[in-house]
């Protein structure tokens, strides 16, 4: 069994203010069991953007049906983008446990925000 990889295909994504940003992420294996979380930034100060397991994230929707048993696509869409959303977003796989522990991170996708077209 190949070790799980977290694939964030795009190094960068550019979106106009007010639009939605799609950040792609797929994993290459169903093992180990555990949730996906999205963060902006890295390190201890990183900001949680989406947690597959729990929480309320009104601007974030999953692109595919993440509840599907064999789902490997954890891409997200963030609505109504503003300049404050700029940064590098990481898709992170966690291993199920008490508590869940970080298993592997994607390479990151840098989101840049263009001025709203006039």
């Amino acid at each position: 069994e190949e070790e799980l990889q977290v694939i964030q295909p795009d190094k960068s994504v550019s979106v106009a203010a007010g639009e939605s940003a799609i950040l792609h992420c797929t994993v290459t294996s169903l093992i180990p069991v555990g949730p996906i979380q999205w963060f902006r930034g890295a390190g201890p100060a990183r900001e949680l953007i989406y947690n597959q397991k729990e929480g309320h994230f009104p601007r974030v929707t999953t692109v595919s049906e993440s509840t599907k048993r064999e789902n490997m696509d954890f891409s997200i869409s963030i609505s109504n983008i503003t300049p404050a959303d700029a940064g590098t977003y990481y898709c992170v796989k966690f291993r199920k446990g008490s508590p869940d522990t970080e298993f592997k991170s994607g390479a990151g996708t840098e989101l840049s925000v263009r001025a709203k077209p006039s």
């Epitope: 694939i7 795009d10 190094k11 994993v27 290459t28």
Partner: antibody, heavy 119, light 103 residues
Amino acid sequence: DVQLVESEGGVVRPGESLRLSCEASGFTFRNSYMTWVRQAPGEGLEWVSTISDTGDTAYYADSVKGRFTISRDNSKNSLYLQMNSLRAEDTAIYYCAKSWIWWTFFDYWGLGTLVTVSS
Amino acid sequence: ALTQPASVSANLGGTVEITCSGGNSNHYGWYQQKSPGSAPVTLIYADTNRPSNIPSRFSGSTSGSTSTLTITGVQAEDEAVYYCGGSSTGDGIFGAGTTLTVL
């Protein structure tokens, strides 16, 4: 064994239409994104179109957008490419390919079928 | 766009590296085509993964914006065109191809 078998291509005139099909076996077709890639004579590989596992999302290269339509029938393990308003520059070998996990990666390819657009 | 050398050469039994760089991709794949019009064969997908039917002399690695296909113990039958492929849709998926000549 994974097998992807494209239908016979053919010779058509500019402006005409042609439909290609690809029959898949040896894997769970309904779970796989599928792709058409082409290669013009003496040229490199060019991505044409990709369709999602359920068939509800399709992606197209700018060069074929509005003229080509990708579709699939999961009950028949078949992939299709409807090519309309064909141009001389569409002359190529068309390969059916199975996408792996992320759709720009391909793990299996068909043998290809030649489409010639000529007056 | 993905950039790769137009051609490289290697001695029989030697080692050769083919690079692919540029574009907006975090990940890369490698495909081999032995003659024009023949079906491509996947050598590497997602940087390092090798299909089970591919010999272990083919390996892939990615560092930053550059992916490298390494062939160790080059065989005569490795003479072919090698295409890199990117993970970002904006990259046009494929590089222009590198022709490997075995000396």
